[in-house]
Interface confidence: low
């Protein structure tokens, strides 16, 4: 059962796991639903009646029963873990708390102008879990304006005291605000041999990366697979770190793989979410339950439905024995993985997919697509809406691409001579424009939010963001698509889709099955030479043949152009303007979306 | 105030001719390339013709090639469209719209409220 709402002067008592120091009980909350085992809290708050080296302390806790006997304690603050809930769950803390001095290693001391330069400082340092600023009120004249980046073994505080004029917060990197880069690779055959801060069971290179990525400290991995000599070693993951926040020496070693923490880049990848299936190998653990079920398939559903469990085993039934079902055992252990991994025993083991929701809706993966032919297919192109206007007679006006649950990214020049957001209709899930009915459910449009530098299209800034008056359900034929990390600026995309009602040629008419076309980026300096008469800034991307042919053209504006990389699909570009259609040596020009991502970032995270 | 109003539609037999016109005003016409858009009843919107904003470059719908001609004149900021040999798959609302060019939505800026035109025997 999930339970948002907090108990105020309320302790459950018993079932401690550990004890963290949060500056607020809705961090505490955060903090627990990323822990692997907790499943409810105590907070408590700053108060007279407390103990001071109490407050801001924050109980993680678990139960068998998911539930704990309940006392009154003033000051005191319980909720439950967000696990038990279905919706979006966020570890991105904006919050800036105010004459909170949140104690850790001060690792760096620098002078900023403001709590937010202090912040993004943080957000860009590699090392950086939360700060603390020195405010120009603050009574030692050497400390003002001071900013102490920090960082501890677990990411929180080690301990949270009240200090006039200072103010605390947390890393943004959570948020997708960092700058860091995007290091996606995993670097066959190489030890990285740097300080281990932890070790894991893994059951291949990929959920060692997803676990550095979201353990505090880890920067970096290496994972030894099951071909790896030393037995006792096989599929055993090391979480790294370094002074530089590289690696200092990297050894030449088969059967071992190395990579980085996806950190700054988590945003557009899956890291919480381990979805694959693991034949012939065994999870040990903490036994929860054994269970009947027919697949693993549906053992792995019975795991994600029980709270508590973290990974499974699944060992199929023998000829005729049970109807046809094998046992499934869930498991769970201190850390949410293994305790041992063993092979050749004939199991089929997973991950739960309860964590799926920690993670962006717009990594999960979609149906696989039909490839040749230009008619898309039903669930294709999730992300892709078809924005209508109703003034003077209702009509396609534009493409535009779910980024959110009440946002539409899409281009500013769309709304030339659109005076109001009243008049316009957003219709998701859209295969055939014959589709829409009078009665057809549409999303209303609340605001329209153009990038106030836009003048017109050729000049650039041709973004603009429609926030939806309801929000969007997700299901297979209505979800985000990712954007682009900001640390992926130097990724070669090579596998790029433009989409849309648009005409199929000049002076054509909008098209009724939404279209297709597979389009290869061009570099600016190319783009460039197509288009002497205007300037290819770097905030805008072209794609398109030499000889023409496949292009956007009217009506496919504002729609995605979209990049699949690393299974994962990310909004490249947004369908702006070019010299004709389809024209030889005149490529179609997109806004490049990942020049826009703070500016999106500002206006949809706003409060 | 932007402003364009369409005149001439009516009901005509198969085989005639009309001509229908669109005033405009509010804005720099001669600075804008124009088209004429039909929605026939229960159809979706259907680019007729365009005319670039010096009166060149006039581009036709196959469906319409032939028998239809656009022009306009900047002195007098309006926009025409002589609809010949007409077919009663010609039947529609025609408005007249500002073009913003090749792929820019199927927005078309300015619109007008439309002109009825009715082909049958």
């Known amino acids: 059962e999930c339970v948002t709402q907090l108990l105020k002067d309320t302790c459950f008592e018993g079932g401690d796991i550990t004890t963290v120091f949060t500056p607020s009980a809705k961090y505490c909350q955060v903090v627990c639903t990323y822990h692997p085992r907790c499943l409810l809290f105590t907070f408590t708050a700053e108060s007279p009646s407390e103990d001071p080296t109490r407050w801001f302390t924050c109980v993680l806790k678990d139960s068998v029963t998911e539930t704990l006997p309940r006392v009154n304690r003033t000051a005191a603050i319980s909720g439950y873990s967000f696990k038990q809930c279905s919706h979006q769950i966020s570890a991105c803390n904006k919050d800036i708390y105010v004459d909170l001095d949140m104690k850790g290693i001060n690792y760096n001391s620098s002078v900023a102008k403001s709590a937010q330069e202090c912040q993004e400082r943080c957000t860009d340092d590699v090392h950086c879990h939360f700060f603390t600023y020195a405010t120009r009120q603050f009574p030692s004249l050497e400390h003002r304006n001071i900013c102490l980046l920090k960082h501890t073994q677990t990411g929180t505080p080690t301990r949270i005291t009240k200090l006039d004029k200072v103010v605390s917060g947390f890393s943004l990197k959570s948020c997708a605000l960092s700058n860091l880069a995007c290091i996606r690779d995993i670097f066959p055959n190489t030890v990285f041999a740097d300080s281990n801060i932890d070790s894991v069971m893994a059951p291949d290179a990929f959920v060692c990366g997803r676990i550095c990525t979201h353990h505090p400290g880890c920067l970096f991995f290496t994972f030894f697979s099951q071909e790896w000599p030393k037995e006792s070693q096989r599929n055993l993951c090391l979480l790294k770190t370094s002074e530089s926040g590289l690696p200092s020496t990297r050894i030449k070693k088969s059967k071992a793989l190395s990579g980085f923490s996806l950190q700054s880049c988590r945003h557009s990848i899956p890291v919480f979410c381990h979805s694959s299936f693991y034949h012939d190998t065994d999870f040990l653990g903490e036994e929860l339950d054994i269970v009947a079920a027919k697949s693993h398939e549906a053992c792995q559903k019975l795991c994600t439905n029980a709270v508590r469990c973290q990974f499974f085993t699944y060992t199929p039934a023998q000829a005729s024995c049970n109807e046809g079902k094998g046992k499934c055992y869930l498991k769970l252990s201190s850390n949410g993985s293994p305790t041992k991994i063993l092979h050749g025993r004939g199991g089929i083991s997973g991950y739960t997919l309860r964590l799926c929701k920690m993670d962006n809706e717009c990594t999960t993966k979609i149906k696989p697509r039909i490839v040749g032919g230009t008619a898309s297919v039903r669930g294709e192109w999730p992300w892709q809406v078809t924005l209508h206007t109703t003034s003077p007679t209702q009509r396609h006006l534009c493409g535009g691409s779910i980024i959110g649950n009440q946002w539409i990214l899409t281009a500013a020049h769309c709304f030339y001579g659109v005076e109001s957001p009243k008049i316009l209709r957003v219709y998701s899930g859209i295969l055939n424009q014959s589709e829409i009915k009078e009665d057809t459910s549409f999303f209303g449009v609340q605001e329209i939010i153009i990038h106030d530098q836009y003048k017109m299209a050729e000049s650039g800034y041709d973004i603009a963001l429609l926030k939806l008056e309801t929000t969007v359900n997700y299901t297979d034929s209505q979800r985000p698509i990712c954007l682009p990390s900001k640390g992926d600026r130097n990724v070669i995309y090579t596998d790029c889709w433009v989409t849309g009602w648009g005409y199929r040629k000049l002076r054509d008419k909008i098209q009724n099955t939404l279209q297709k076309a597979k389009i290869p980026l061009v570099t600016n300096e190319e783009c460039q030479k197509r288009y002497r008469g205007h300037k290819i800034t770097h905030k805008m991307i072209c794609a398109g043949y030499r000889e023409g042919g496949k292009d956007a053209c009217k009506g496919d504006s504002g729609g995605p152009l979209s990049c699949k990389h690393n299974e994962v699909w990310h909004l490249v570009g947004i369908t702006s303007w070019g010299e004709g259609c389809a024209q030889r040596e005149r490529p179609g020009v997109y806004t490049n979306v990942v020049e826009y991502v703070d500016w999106i970032l500002e206006k949809t995270q706003a409060v | 105030q932007v402003q364009l109003q369409e005149s001439g539609g009516g009901l005509v037999q198969p085989g005639g001719s009309l001509r229908l016109s669109c005033a405009a005003s509010?804005?720099?016409?001669?600075?804008?390339?124009m088209s004429w858009v039909r929605q026939a009843p229960g159809k979706g919107l259907e680019g007729v013709s365009g005319?670039?904003?010096?009166?060149?470059?006039?581009h036709y719908a196959d469906s319409v090639k032939g028998r239809f001609t656009i022009s306009r004149d900047n002195a007098k900021n309006t926009l025409y469209l002589q609809m010949n040999s007409l077919k009663t798959e010609d039947t529609a609302v025609y408005f007249c719209?500002?073009?913003?060019?090749?792929?820019?939505?199927?927005?078309?800026?300015?619109w007008g409220q439309g002109t009825q035109v009715t082909v049958s025997s």
């Open positions: 719209a500002t073009d913003e060019g090749e792929r820019y939505g199927e927005d078309f800026g300015y």
């Open positions: 509010g804005f720099t016409f001669s600075n804008y390339d």
């Open positions: 005319i670039n904003s010096g009166g060149g470059h006039p």
